[in-house]
Every structure is written in structure tokens, then in C-alpha cells.
């Protein structure tokens, strides 16, 4: 509801506005009600971030946001007597939080993470421009199912990139994937400016490759049956089936959005299995098939990360060259 009467005079400002950080990237502002507010006013609080984004009118005396603390962020808060956005709130009080100190050129860049097969997360980053080449990095991570911030132990080097991987298994809790993983990278010596990232669990998901179970010919059609990677249901995946013919040296790629095993030629009721029929394939030549998968937007925000290709499987016979 809209609360009680809305006196015409402006309410006093909120008091004791303070800001703190929880976990790695959860910023929380709290405040106290204004002193000397009208007795017939049902207090609501108007707040928005410094760039006038995310306006909110709510009765709670706190507001939080999950944000990578790579830049200064400010919240302005005012009080008012109704939920009406057109009502002029009190004088707005502002409280800002700045990122940790340090030379911005020393902070790591290109910090990104990929959730591999919904079982482990692999993050990688580039050293900052003003960083000694022998800098030792540490990655910290936190997500909702952890009680405290964890330090990633498996630091590796891959070309010019540093990285670290940690276990992150999809839990049955249906809301798990609606959350994010909070990441921070800094150096052991405390010389570089820390870098933060927030990885939504519905993006940057890379499935394992599928496993081809069976290839068979029926007339001039090639029936392909494969097992999807663990942890994924078939309706959440798109597929690419590549068929190479040794005789004609043709290379056909089929983009498959639905891969149901409804045709009688396919083995039925096999858990987590998908199927596709490749039309017009010559049975008396050698055909080599491989498949890759990616998440789709039915279940995930991101649909750009293909799995690696499956192992190849061949069917037919190689013709002797004459």
C-alpha cells in the first residue's frame, strides 16, 4: 500500500547513513529514520545510485547491491511519506564507497570465468600494465552456498594469462543458478590494486563434449545417437553435428536445435540421449562424425560457448583407390 497521509512539508533527511561490504562484492547501505519526522507520516525511503539508476521506494532502512568494486559507487537516500514517485523526498543524503587503493594500471585485466560442465569454475586474467612479471596472484571467491570467502588454490599459467580453477557443483536447489559467484584477484604482496568480477551462474557455461553412442544407416540416411554431457538436460542444449565423407571430401555441418530420439530406428528411452538423422549419406563410403554442444537461451543467458568436439566415430567403408 501507499502508507498514510502525505503531508505537504518535506520530511527531514535520513540519519547515520553508512556503507559496508560483505563477502567480496555485496555492498550494503544502512540508515536510521529521520529525526523529527511527522507523526502522521508512514515513512518510505527513496534511493538511487549516483547515476540516477535503479530508483527504489521501500520501507526498509537498508539497501544492498551486488557489484564489482572496481569503481566508486554512491547511493543517495531520502525519506518521504508515500510510495508516490512524484512526491518530493527529503534532502537526499549520499554515501559512497571507493574501490581498494592502488595504481589502476597495476590491476589485472580481462578477468573472466567459465563454469565448466556445471562442475568447476575456471577463471583467468591478464597481468596489469604496471606489474612486475614475477607477481604472485591470489584469487578469492564466494557464492551463496559458501559460509565464508574461499581462496583458490589451483593457480596456473596459460600463455600470457594467469588462472585458477575451483570446484563449483550445481546443487539441486532450484534457485542456485539464479545467483552469482563473486571473484577478487590480488597479489600476495599487496602491491597491485585488487580486481573484482561477478559471474552470473546462468552465463559463461561451457559443457563437456558429448559422447557418440551409435551410428547406423537406414536407406541413404545416417542416424546419429549420442549421450549429452552430465549435468545438462537435452532441452537446454543446442548441437552441431559435423559429417565428413572421405570419398566426396564433403564436409557438412548441421546446426541442431532439437534432437529427439523419436524415430523407430533410434534406441529408445536412453537417459540423456539425443539423436539426429543426417539425410542423403552414401553408405558405401567412409563417413566420420563428430558433435559439439552449447547451452541455449531456454535455460541460460549465454549461448556462445561451444563444448570441445566429441571424439570422432566413423561408419561405412573406405573405398580402395584405383
Amino acid at each position: 500500500g501507499g502508507g498514510g497521509a502525505a503531508p505537504t512539508e518535506t520530511q527531514p533527511p535520513v540519519t547515520n547513513l553508512s556503507v559496508s561490504v560483505e563477502n567480496l562484492c555485496t555492498v550494503i547501505w544502512t540508515w536510521n529514520p529521520p529525526e523529527g519526522a511527522s507523526s502522521n507520516c508512514s515513512l518510505w525511503y527513496f534511493s538511487h545510485f549516483g547515476d540516477k539508476q535503479d530508483k527504489k521506494i521501500a520501507p526498509e532502512t537498508r539497501r544492498s547491491i551486488e557489484v564489482p568494486l572496481n569503481e566508486r559507487i554512491c547511493l543517495q537516500v531520502g525519506s518521504q511519506c508515500s510510495t508516490n514517485e512524484s512526491e518530493k523526498p527529503s534532502i537526499l543524503v549520499e554515501k559512497c564507497i571507493s574501490p581498494p587503493e592502488g595504481d589502476p594500471e597495476s590491476a589485472v585485466t580481462e578477468l573472466q570465468c567459465i563454469w565448466h560442465n556445471l562442475s568447476y569454475m575456471k577463471c583467468s586474467w591478464l597481468p596489469g600494465r604496471n606489474t612486475s612479471p614475477d607477481t604472485n596472484y591470489t584469487l578469492y571467491y564466494w557464492h551463496r552456498s559458501l559460509e565464508k570467502i574461499h581462496q583458490c588454490e589451483n593457480i596456473f599459467r596459460e600463455g600470457q594469462y594467469f588462472g585458477c580453477s575451483f570446484d563449483l557443483t550445481k546443487v539441486k536447489d532450484s534457485s542456485f543458478e539464479q545467483h552469482s559467484v563473486q571473484i577478487m584477484v590480488k597479489d600476495n604482496a599487496g602491491k597491485i590494486k585488487p580486481s573484482f568480477n561477478i559471474v552470473p551462474l546462468t552465463s559463461r557455461v561451457k559443457p563437456d563434449p558429448p559422447h557418440i553412442k551409435n551410428l547406423s544407416f537406414h536407406n541413404d540416411d545416417l542416424y546419429v545417437q549420442w549421450e549429452n554431457p552430465q549435468n545438462f538436460i537435452s532441452r537446454c542444449l543446442f548441437y552441431e553435428v559435423e559429417v565428413n565423407n572421405s570419398q566426396t571430401e564433403t564436409h557438412n555441418v548441421f546446426y541442431v536445435q532439437e534432437a529427439k530420439c523419436e524415430n523407430p530406428e533410434f534406441e529408445r528411452n536412453v537417459e540423456n540421449t539425443s539423436c539426429f538423422m543426417v539425410p542423403g549419406v552414401l553408405p558405401d563410403t567412409l563417413n566420420t562424425v563428430r558433435i559439439r554442444v552449447k547451452t541455449n537461451k531456454l535455460c541460460y543467458e549465454d549461448d556462445k560457448l561451444w563444448s570441445n568436439w566429441s571424439q570422432e566415430m566413423s561408419i561405412g567403408k573406405k573405398r580402395n583407390s584405383t
Epitope: T109, L126, P133, G159, Q160, Y161
Partner: antibody
């Protein structure tokens, strides 16, 4: 075996544009920084530009900033240098060089391609 | 920018000689220095990185030393194929800079 093969060098008039390419093979292209280094006739080496493995981060020498653009196509294992507003002093052999890691030395070099800016 | 100064600019030596080239940085660069060899009409070749680490495949007669501002490349026993121009390069801070080169000629 690591191989870097530059192409695209030519004789060009001042103010003109040119695009150099560098085809890479023999290593995992998308995890290494790639550089352009040039050498004017009879002179020493001058670093021109670098691009990170994913192609997100780029840096330039002051002498080419705003005129040259470095880019890469990781699907083709190819590095590029787009050169605009060319000047006589850009005349040089342009080498592409693989970074051994990020802010580091160059462990492999191409054979170079000659760019001549003259009217 | 960090200036790199090599000395000498050129030198004449005989096969079997011990040759030393120095490189001085205008400010401290820790050990972040590389050495390259370049033969006429050829691309440079990496010899040494991190001041003293030998690039794989480079003969052990090449060695590097130094840290901070003063660095040395030493060829313990000069071979016919070593006649070339040698460059140092700092990678402590952007932009990367090279020395002007030292030409090693046959006496």
C-alpha cells in the same frame, strides 16, 4: 614448430592506408600476446603495438597512437596491423613477434614485410 | 620512457674471442631484460630473457647477467655464425624499448 608469416607490405603514398597480416602456426595462438615491431632502413628496432591473447587489451607506441590499429582473428590464427595516415617516417620492415608471456620479451619473430611510404 | 644504451656501438673480434656487450637502463628494470641477435636481412632471434635465462636452442656460449640498471651479454668463445648485431630490450615498463644495437664484426 612456431611460424609467423607477415604479408601486406607495399609502396604507399603519404596519407595512405595499408593493412599488414601475420599468419601464425605451431602454437596455441589465442593465449599469447602478439606484437608488431618495426625497423627503419639501417636503424634499430622499435616496438609498435601489442594485443592480448583474447584481443581485448591493446597498447601502442606514442609514435603511432591514433593512426595504427592492432587486431587479431583467433579463429584464423592471424594478427593484423591497420596503418592509416601513413608518413615517410613509418617506412620500415614490420615484424610480428610472439610474446613469451604478457609484459615480456619476444620469443619468436616473423621474417618481416617492407612498408615504404613515399610520393 | 626508459632509455636503453648499449656499448660499444660496434666491435671487431676474432673467432674464439670472449666478447662482452653492455646495456644500461635509464632507470631500474629489475631483471626484465632480453637480448636478441640479428643478422643482415634477417629477423631478430631471441637469445636471453629475464637478464640471464637462455632461450631454448641457444648455444651455452651465450650468457647474460646483471640487474637493476646494468646488464651484460657475454659470448664466451666467438663462432663464425655469431657475427651479427645484438640488441637489448627492457620489459619492466611500457612502452618496451630497445638499445640502439651493437654490431659484432670480424677483425
Amino acid at each position: 614448430e612456431v611460424q609467423l608469416l607477415e604479408s601486406g607490405g607495399d609502396l604507399i603514398q603519404p596519407g595512405g592506408s595499408l593493412r599488414l597480416s601475420c599468419a601464425a602456426s605451431g602454437f596455441t595462438f589465442n593465449i599469447y600476446a602478439m606484437n608488431w615491431v618495426r625497423q627503419a632502413p639501417g636503424k634499430g628496432l622499435e616496438w609498435v603495438s601489442v594485443i592480448s591473447g583474447r584481443g581485448i587489451t591493446t597498447y601502442y607506441a606514442d609514435s603511432v597512437k591514433g593512426r595504427f590499429t592492432i587486431s587479431r582473428d583467433n579463429s584464423k590464427n592471424t594478427l593484423y596491423l591497420q596503418m592509416d595516415s601513413l608518413r615517410a617516417e613509418d617506412t620500415a620492415v614490420y615484424y610480428c613477434a610472439k610474446g613469451s608471456s604478457y609484459w615480456t620479451d619476444f620469443d619468436y619473430w616473423g621474417q618481416g614485410t617492407l612498408v615504404t611510404v613515399s610520393s | 620512457d626508459i632509455q636503453m644504451t648499449q656499448s660499444p656501438s660496434s666491435l671487431s673480434a676474432s673467432v674464439g674471442d670472449r666478447v662482452t656487450i653492455t646495456c644500461r637502463a635509464s632507470q631500474g628494470i629489475s631483471s626484465w631484460l632480453a637480448w636478441y641477435q640479428q643478422k643482415p636481412e634477417k629477423a631478430p632471434k631471441s637469445l636471453i630473457y629475464a637478464a640471464s635465462s637462455l632461450q631454448s636452442g641457444v648455444p651455452s656460449r651465450f650468457s647474460g647477467s646483471g640487474s637493476g640498471t646494468d646488464f651484460t651479454l657475454t659470448i664466451s668463445s666467438l663462432q663464425p655464425e655469431d657475427f651479427a648485431t645484438y640488441y637489448c630490450q627492457q620489459y619492466n615498463s611500457y612502452p618496451w624499448t630497445f638499445g640502439q644495437g651493437t654490431k659484432v664484426e670480424i677483425k
